[in-house]
Amino acid sequence: QPSVSPGEPSPPSIHPGKSDLIVRVGDEIRLLCTDPGFVKWTFEILDETNENKQNEWITEKAEATNTGKYTCTNKHGLSNSIYVFVRDPAKLFLVDRSLYGKEDNDTLVRCPLTDPEVTNYSLKGCQGKPLPKDLRFIPDPKAGIMIKSVKRAYHRLCLHCSVDQEGKSVLSEKFILKVRPAFKAVPVVSVSKASYLLREGEEFTVTCTIKDVSSSVYSTWKRENSQTKLQEKYNSWHHGDFNYERQATLTISSARVNDSGVFMCYANNTFGSANVTTTLEVVDKGFINIFPMINTTVFVNDGENVDLIVEYEAFPKPEHQQWIYMNRTFTDKWEDYPKSENESNIRYVSELHLTRLKGTEGGTYTFLVSNSDVNAAIAFNVYVNTKPEILTYDRLVNGMLQCVAAGFPEPTIDWYFCPGTEQRCSASVLPVDVQTLNSSGPPFGKLVVQSSIDSSAFKHNGTVECKAYNDVGKTSAYFNFAFKGNNKEQIHPHTLFTP
């Protein structure tokens, strides 16, 4: 019995004065607690607790279930205990069959003994199966058998507590060990789509998938920079004992522009946390934005090809697209396709393929696109570069020599005089008059230039060259002169092609 110095409160004393007491089933249990400040007796075994306010605890006919710890407490909160074993050959174990173990922790198989003098108190597998090789345990007759460092592999392990009594092995009722996995990694989170674009009034619904080893993983949807509780719905699946999946679906039934923002799916367990975000953009109405991929003013050489390419953003998705030239709609030579196969894609590409363009095919080519909310268009001005062509070269009645040339860009006409029989005309002659004839309206077609010189300036036999040129090429026409006395005679003009 404990002893303390006088003046200090002392714990109660119990009779009989021993830490353990063994009685036989059917015998009397009589325990006396002596203390001036007696408060109560408490009996504990497994999860059961009983109290008695009498200082003498009497059980007339002891049963195995009276096995347990009897504690006497005084008004100072000091206590003293005695452990009573009620030996019952027919009931060697008291059991609480609920057996949960946390992975990597110890767990107690609660099968305390009613007789501490039996031997070989241990665990055995059910139906004669051996226990896992790495399973370690520590027996304690008053509490049960502690399994050390529970492994995930022990999940659903069937066990018995076992003792030897009079040379024979006696088994308790069976226990099934249910293992709670330890979190050894953060949850795996993913989202159905990384971004959403909606019109006002449409439903926003996004699903976050959380994967972990057990259902005790926590998850929630949060709005960035907001504490507002979001409405979410959960569904879950057990794909394996340690393979759990939850889907958390966030819904806004009628989205508004001010619902736009970043939403975070957050999950955490005892190991750590993980998150994934999705962006919501809500617009008051749909839109189309067109981006030309080439300059909208296009210059192309006669006979060459050109591709007119646009990219455009359209939301909702485009419903009608067309290319138009001179009020005619192209039925072929163009293609339209999404920029990506992504479900969230709003960007598209349209290409018009113009092949072997003629000088007459310059002009405005227009791309038109529409969706349920808006229409949009973009125009390309296509200029076809052509080598000058000399349309007319004449001596007029007033003695002027006139040369008319057409081409794009606008041709320049230079005049040269070649005296005598020289092949090369180098002496330039200044024109009297230069006019661009068709400058009214958009200059997509060939530009016509007229240039004139005064033939009276020529006093010798020779050749006059009219040379029309631009960035693409040049063409010449020639006037041959011969003098007979005082009369000037024009020999037939002719052209020479100069590539």
């Epitope: 999860d47 609920s98 949960y100 659903r156 249910k178 709670r180 057990s214 259902s215 005790s216 926590y218 998850s219 929630t220 959960y234 569904n235 879950s236 699946w237 057990h238 794909h239 394996g240 004992d241 939850r246 958390a248």
Partner: antibody, heavy 118, light 107 residues
């Protein structure tokens, strides 16, 4: 010994509300998911709702979604079911049960009767 | 949602008989199939979880088997205390759902 004790049942008019409680003892309450299951008179069992051990995540049967709310107070070892907009078809014995999808519902309370009638 | 269909809805048997109850899921539910026993006026009691694991304290005459969509509860030798209603339940995916029940009566 694991014990679950439901309370809060009774007679309520259609459209009314009721809050059921389930007091738990004999185990570490916060370690276990908890469910409500109901049984209409003479009928089979119907799972109603489940809440995770931490209380952070909840699940509902379609028949009660938006009307019933499951919650728990781990400091008081108590599970709750707030039932709003009650209908005649919600008349049943309501059981609380311990457990999750992996190990089944291993402990049940004795049930509390909810009668929805005008 | 996964529907659970139990058959038969009721059966009559004698003590000592071997009794088999089947449960079919509307889609595959791996092994997450539980069986419960309920006696009149009492709460259900878990017999078997995860298709075939006997809950502690449940007599070994009860056994469960099956996989995918088809599952079976077998009572190898019916005892007087086994006359009750039996329910299957899937806990593979929420919402968890029960079968309609099988009432085992005395012949």
């Amino acid at each position: 010994e694991v014990q679950l004790l439901e309370s809060g049942g009774g007679l309520v008019q259609p459209g009314g509300s009721l809050r059921l409680s389930c007091a738990a003892s004999g185990f570490t309450f916060g370690n276990f998911a908890m469910s409500w299951v109901r049984q209409a008179p003479g009928k089979g069992l119907e799972w109603v709702s489940l809440i995770s051990g931490s209380g952070g995540n909840t699940y509902y049967a379609d028949s009660v979604k938006g009307r019933f709310t499951i919650s728990r107070d781990n400091s008081k070892n108590t599970l709750y079911l707030q039932m709003n907009s009650l209908r005649a078809e919600d008349t049943a014995v309501y059981y609380c049960a311990r457990g999750d999808g992996v190990n089944g519902f291993d402990y049940w309370g004795q049930g509390t009767l909810v009668t929805v009638s005008s | 949602d996964i529907q659970m269909t139990q058959s038969p809805s009721s059966l009559s048997a004698s003590v000592g008989d071997r009794v088999t109850i089947t449960c079919r899921a509307s889609q595959s539910i791996p092994t997450y199939l539980n069986w419960y026993q309920q006696k009149p006026g009492k709460a259900p009691k878990l017999l078997i979880y995860a298709t075939s694991t006997l809950e502690s304290g449940v007599p070994s005459r009860f056994s469960g088997s099956g996989s995918g969509t088809d599952f079976t509860l077998t009572i190898s030798s019916l005892q007087p205390e086994d006359f009750a209603t039996y329910y299957c339940q899937q806990t593979y995916s929420t919402p968890y759902t029960f079968g309609g029940g099988t009432k085992v009566e005395i012949k």
